[in-house]
């Protein structure tokens, strides 16, 4: 099985009530504009046959797609709590920039394109149940990393 | 519309299995789970358990390890929870409810089923 | 494992009223809590999910709040519809866990 390597956060990251209060609210006000319920992009199809040593670097991944793909061109939008939750997400995404697995990820890269593929398709509203999940987001950072 | 239908009422005697059925309909059924809830008369809820219609992945209480076991035929769309040993203290209404499994509440739940241990 | 408790676990209320039900995580579980009414001989229903949003088809005066390890559920004013009983749920990581439910009667 691939190792991972410094794929860890400080569970002092997931302590901080202020920020994952933003975080939270920002995820509720997001998932009140999205109107597809049925459709989940973190859960358990974006880990089926990934190992639980490998989910910090599954969920790295998935960060870094949701900053550069969703937030960043998103950032104007659900003020105030956007401004503050993205500079915690990024700085996350720095402490994750070493996290790597030896050996064969292409796994993790096919769950993860599928998730990828799901927000693209979807266009927009895409984009907004990114943001609805970051909850989720948050959740399997926490879960698999810490 | 989105239902969840379950099998009849069963009597048992004590140390027999019992196996309920959980029809879905109306929703993509490996999109979602089943969680299996059971209520003894008179008494609250108890969570026995969660299969995934999508893999057959299943995490069950640890009180009903060993004495559970869940399964879904996907070809028709139906959860099947069977129990096994059954005691008198097993006496209960039988739920099965939606539910994706990671962070996810009970939406659709189905009538329920009486299972009674008697010998 | 997560223990939920729920108090009171009988209540006495009339038409009108404003009702609260409360339940206590035995660790903090941020949002994940829900909560069900059940009427006698039937299934559960969903009411409240993520502990404030509120579920396809349940009436706006029912409301949810809390976060962390205390969670409320509220009706505004009620109604003859409201005497049964409610549940607090945590939804977990594949895992759930109910509280000991509270039985909203007629004074």
């Known amino acids: 099985a691939p190792i991972s390597s410094h794929c860890r956060l400080d569970k002092s990251n997931f302590q901080q009530p202020y920020i994952t209060n933003r975080t939270f609210m920002l995820a509720k006000e997001a998932s009140l504009a999205d109107n597809n319920t049925d459709v989940r992009l973190i859960g358990e199809k974006l880990f089926h046959g990934v190992s639980m040593s490998e989910r910090c670097y599954l969920m790295k991944q998935v960060l870094n797609f949701t900053l550069e793909e969703v937030l960043f061109p998103q950032s104007d939008r659900f003020q105030p709590y956007m401004q503050e939750v993205v500079p915690f997400l990024a700085r996350l995404s720095n402490r994750l920039s070493t996290c790597h697995i030896e050996g064969d990820d292409l796994h993790i890269q096919r769950n993860v394109q599928k998730l990828k593929d799901t927000v693209k398709k979807l266009g927009e509203s895409g984009e907004i149940k990114a943001i609805g999940e970051l909850d989720l987001l948050f959740m399997s950072l926490r879960n698999a990393c810490i | 519309q989105v239902q969840l239908v379950e099998s009849g009422a069963e009597v048992k005697k004590p140390g027999a299995s019992v196996k309920v059925s959980c029809k879905a309909s109306?929703?993509?059924?490996?999109?979602?789970?089943i969680s299996w809830v059971r209520q003894a008369p008179g008494q609250g809820l108890e969570w026995m358990g969660w299969?995934?219609?999508?893999?057959?992945?299943?995490n069950y209480a640890q009180k009903f390890q060993g004495r559970v076991t869940m399964t879904t035929d996907t070809s028709t769309s139906t959860a099947y929870m069977e129990l096994r040993s059954l005691r008198s203290d097993d006496t209960a209404v039988y739920y099965c409810?939606?539910?994706?499994?990671?962070?996810?509440?009970?939406?659709?739940w189905g009538q329920g089923t009486l299972v009674t241990v008697s010998s | 494992d997560i223990q939920m408790t729920q108090s009171p676990s009988t209540l006495s209320a009339s038409i009108g009223d404003r009702v609260t039900i409360t339940c206590r995580a035995s660790?903090?579980?941020?949002?994940?809590l829900a909560w069900y009414q059940q009427k006698p001989g039937k299934a559960p229903k969903l009411l409240i999910y993520?502990?404030?949003s509120l579920a396809s088809g349940a009436p706006s005066r029912f409301s949810g709040s809390g976060f962390g390890t205390d969670f409320t559920l509220t009706i505004s004013s009620l109604q003859p519809d409201d005497f049964a009983t409610y549940y607090c749920?945590?939804?977990?990581?594949?895992?759930?866990?109910f509280g000991g439910g509270t039985k909203l009667e007629i004074k």
């Open positions: 409810a939606r539910d994706r499994g990671y962070y996810d509440a009970f939406d659709i």
């Open positions: 109306g929703y993509t059924f490996t999109s979602y789970g």
């Open positions: 299969i995934s219609a999508y893999t057959g992945n299943t």
């Open positions: 660790e903090g579980i941020y949002h994940w």
């Open positions: 993520k502990a404030s």
């Open positions: 749920q945590q939804m977990g990581e594949w895992k759930a866990a």
